[in-house]
């Protein structure tokens, strides 16, 4: 049988006796887009009519009177079997049972879905004594229903080590469809099929589905949620959301912007961060990137000499973390750098150029054609050399480093001069005699000390010997030229 | 002026999922770079990963397999979801924003996570 | 990964004092270095960029230097409001990744 009550109701007997009712539902407004009717009703479905016996699970007592009389089996009696009501609105549902005196603390536990209630929840047991029976209602009270109350509620109580369970009590809790999945944002290549998904649940069963592009409806008749919109391809970003609809009324879901994946903007903002002889530093804002991400970046660089060929050289990097430190540069250069980043559409144009410039360097090479000989008259040696090739001073010469080292029966000392840079030859006192005198050069501009020429030897014999002969830098493949005078 | 806030459980299971939203106002996060920081107890700061102005994201490739960010501009909040933690996710999550000139100029406040079972 | 050693985790310093604060990257990483200051109970604040470049706002006290792999942070005239942890973070290469912390101890 159904029985349905408005929310106004009395509640009304559960069994003979003057015991309270079994339902009471308030009176909370609905929070959902109202039905035309002037109240929501609350449907009470019993499975069998009251007062008829249980045949769930009944506990039947071993003891007797004094007359030996077996007791009665225990059982909760009927009560209503399904509740039906709006979100937010308030409940009371209840349980009762009559138990002999003769039982002493009786307790009455509540279980919803097979879960022990326990705490924060109103529920009140009530004891009405008589003669020889007791009858107990426990009622179960919400004030204000959600969607994670429903399900089956049921009563438990212990006699003699024997379980008795009532039979269950379903609160359905409707109201406005409530999304379990919505659409995501997404971005898209042009002209791409692709599909969004949405999906809503009740109670009540079913729910709707309508899908709205840029305000407008895109499905004439609804689709049982869930629902897959498959958007054949876009050419402009476009808005979609879904609506769902059940009995209650509809719920919209958010609104997600589907975005069409484009080549990058070209980065802005290239920096100069740091500059070396040889290399430079740069930094970039990167530029919008189409809806997708960036693979890699390009770096390019032409000289910006304008007698330089124009070629340009290309250095490629990944696209974090927005920085490239630009290597093998030329001293004492000009160069434009420009850059450009890749997503999966395609590069993006060429960032405005910039001019960077390299500093002064070291020397790259030594100077060539050392050569050492040893005039006897001045007791000095001279050296003479050729300066290292403009392109490979990395900066203007400023002069030149000489290292001499005297080696003499086990005692070797090691003395550096400076010269300028005008000329390319210097001449240097003879520090001990009957000795091996080792000599370097090296150039040098302000940005350092470039690299030391190979050593050339002269051998300077004891006081009075007068043949002698230069010492150079030896050609290649020859180590260690010692001329012996 | 711009600011960070984060926001999100304090306790969180091992095994489970964390998630954590950052609420952005002062700025708009469909400009710029948006990212997470954390910082273990030991002191010692690990860069996450990050989303951009048109949602693209990067991750430390040593949470690549774990970690989603993910946004949503009508609430102007970005979020950060790290799959089965462990104890070693304890921490306290930074969200912060990148500047151009390459720093993160504003940062959170921190929320500090524990995972234990 | 680029990976930013902070050898000394405490340090300790009088109020007038200048204490300088180091930070050791495993590779290059060019001048592509910040430093943060973090309170106790705040998060962390920007005071140096690109290894040198001070952030607005921040007192001249406090000066950065280095390029490479070897970098240090520098407090002249330390304050009692400077008591903080001091972390460095490189940003030549993603990840970005930071240094272990030094906490500057007033005495």
């Known amino acids: 049988a159904i029985t349905e009550a408005r929310e106004e109701a009395k509640p009304y007997p559960l069994f003979p006796g003057p015991f309270p009712g079994s339902l009471q539902t308030d009176h909370t407004p609905l929070l959902s887009l109202p039905h035309a009717s002037g109240y929501q009703p609350a449907l009470m479905f019993s499975p069998t009519q009251p007062g008829r016996p249980h045949t769930g699970n009944v506990a039947i007592p071993q003891v007797t009177s004094v007359e030996s009389k077996p007791l009665p089996p225990l059982a909760f009696k009927h009560t209503v079997g399904h509740i039906i009501l709006s979100e937010h609105k308030g409940v009371k549902f209840n349980c009762s049972i009559s138990v002999p005196n003769i039982y002493q603390d009786t307790t009455i536990s509540w279980w919803k879905d097979g879960k022990e209630l326990l705490g924060a929840h109103h529920a009140i047991t009530q004891f009405y004594p008589d003669d020889e029976v007791t009858a107990i209602i426990a009622s179960f009270s919400i004030t204000s229903v959600q969607r994670s109350d429903n399900g089956s509620y049921i009563c438990k109580m212990k006699i003699n080590n024997e379980e008795i369970v009532s039979d269950p009590i379903y609160i359905e809790v409707q109201g406005l469809p409530h999304f379990t999945k919505q659409p995501e944002s997404m971005n898209v290549t042009r002209n791409t099929a692709f599909n969004l998904t949405c999906q809503a649940v009740g109670p009540p069963e079913p729910v709707n589905i309508f899908w709205v592009q840029n305000s407008s409806r895109v499905n004439e008749q609804p689709e049982k949620s869930p629902s897959v919109l498959t958007v054949p391809g876009l050419t402009e970003m476009a808005v979609f959301s879904c609506e769902a609809h059940n009995d209650k009324g509809l719920t919209v879901s958010k609104g997600v912007q589907i975005n069409i994946k484009a080549i990058p903007s070209p980065p802005t903002e290239v920096s100069i961060r740091n500059s070396t002889a040889h290399s430079i530093l740069i930094s970039w804002v990167p530029g919008f990137d189409g809806y997708s991400p960036f693979r890699n970046c390009s770096i390019q660089v032409k000289e910006a000499d304008p007698l330089s060929n124009g070629s340009v050289m290309i250095f490629n990097t990944s696209a974090l973390p927005h920085l490239y430190q630009i290597k093998q540069l030329q001293a004492l250069a000009n160069y434009s750098i420009g850059v450009s980043c890749m997503n999966e559409i395609g590069w993006s144009a060429v960032s405005p150029w910039i001019l960077a410039s390299t500093t002064e360097g070291a020397p790259s090479v030594a100077p060539l054609n050392v050569t050492v000989f040893l005039n006897e008259s001045s007791d000095n040696v001279d050296i003479r050399w050729m300066k290292p090739p403009t392109k490979q001073q990395d900066g203007e010469l400023v002069g030149y480093r000489i290292s001499h080292v005297w080696q003499s029966a086990g005692i070797s000392k090691e003395l550096l001069e400076e010269v300028g840079q005008n000329g390319s030859r210097a001449r240097i006192s003879v520090q001990v005699h009957n000795a091996t005198c080792t000599v370097r050069i090296a150039a040098v501009t302000r940005g350092g000390v470039g690299p030391f020429s190979d050593p050339v030897k002269i051998f300077i014999p004891a006081h009075g010997w007068v043949d002698y002969a230069p010492s150079s830098t030896p050609a290649p493949g020859n180590a260690d030229p010692v001329l012996i005078i | 002026e711009v600011q960070l806030q984060e926001s999100g459980p304090s306790l969180v299971k091992p095994s489970q999922t964390l998630s954590l939203t950052c609420s952005v106002t002062?700025?708009?996060?469909?400009?710029?770079?948006w990212n997470w920081i954390r910082k273990f107890p030991g002191n010692k700061l690990e860069y996450m990963g990050y989303?951009?102005?048109?949602?693209?994201?990067n991750y430390n490739p040593s949470l690549k397999s774990r970690i989603s960010i993910t946004r949503d501009t009508s609430k102007n909040q970005y979020y950060l979801q790290l799959n089965s933690v462990t104890t070693e996710d304890t921490a306290t999550y930074y969200c912060?924003?990148?500047?151009?000139?390459?720093?993160?100029?504003?940062w959170g406040q921190g929320t500090t996570l524990t995972v234990s079972s | 990964d680029s990976v930013m050693t902070q050898s000394h985790k405490f340090m300790s310093t009088l109020v007038g004092d200048r204490v300088s604060i180091t930070c050791k990257a495993s590779?290059?990483?060019?001048?592509?270095v910040a430093w943060y200051q973090q309170k106790p109970g705040q998060s962390p604040k920007v005071l140096i960029y690109?290894?040198?470049t001070r952030h607005t706002g921040v007192p001249d006290r406090f000066t950065g230097s280095g390029s490479g792999t070897d970098f240090t942070l520098t407090i002249t005239n330390v304050q009692s409001e400077d008591l903080a942890d001091y972390f460095c973070?490189?940003?030549?290469?993603?990840?970005?990744?930071f240094g272990g912390g030094t906490k500057l101890e007033i005495k």
């Open positions: 912060a924003r990148w500047n151009y000139l390459y720093y993160f100029d504003y």
């Open positions: 002062g700025d708009s996060i469909t400009s710029g770079y």
């Open positions: 989303i951009n102005y048109s949602g693209s994201t």
């Open positions: 690109w290894a040198s």
């Open positions: 590779q290059d990483v060019g001048t592509a």
């Open positions: 973070h490189q940003y030549s290469t993603y990840p970005y990744t």
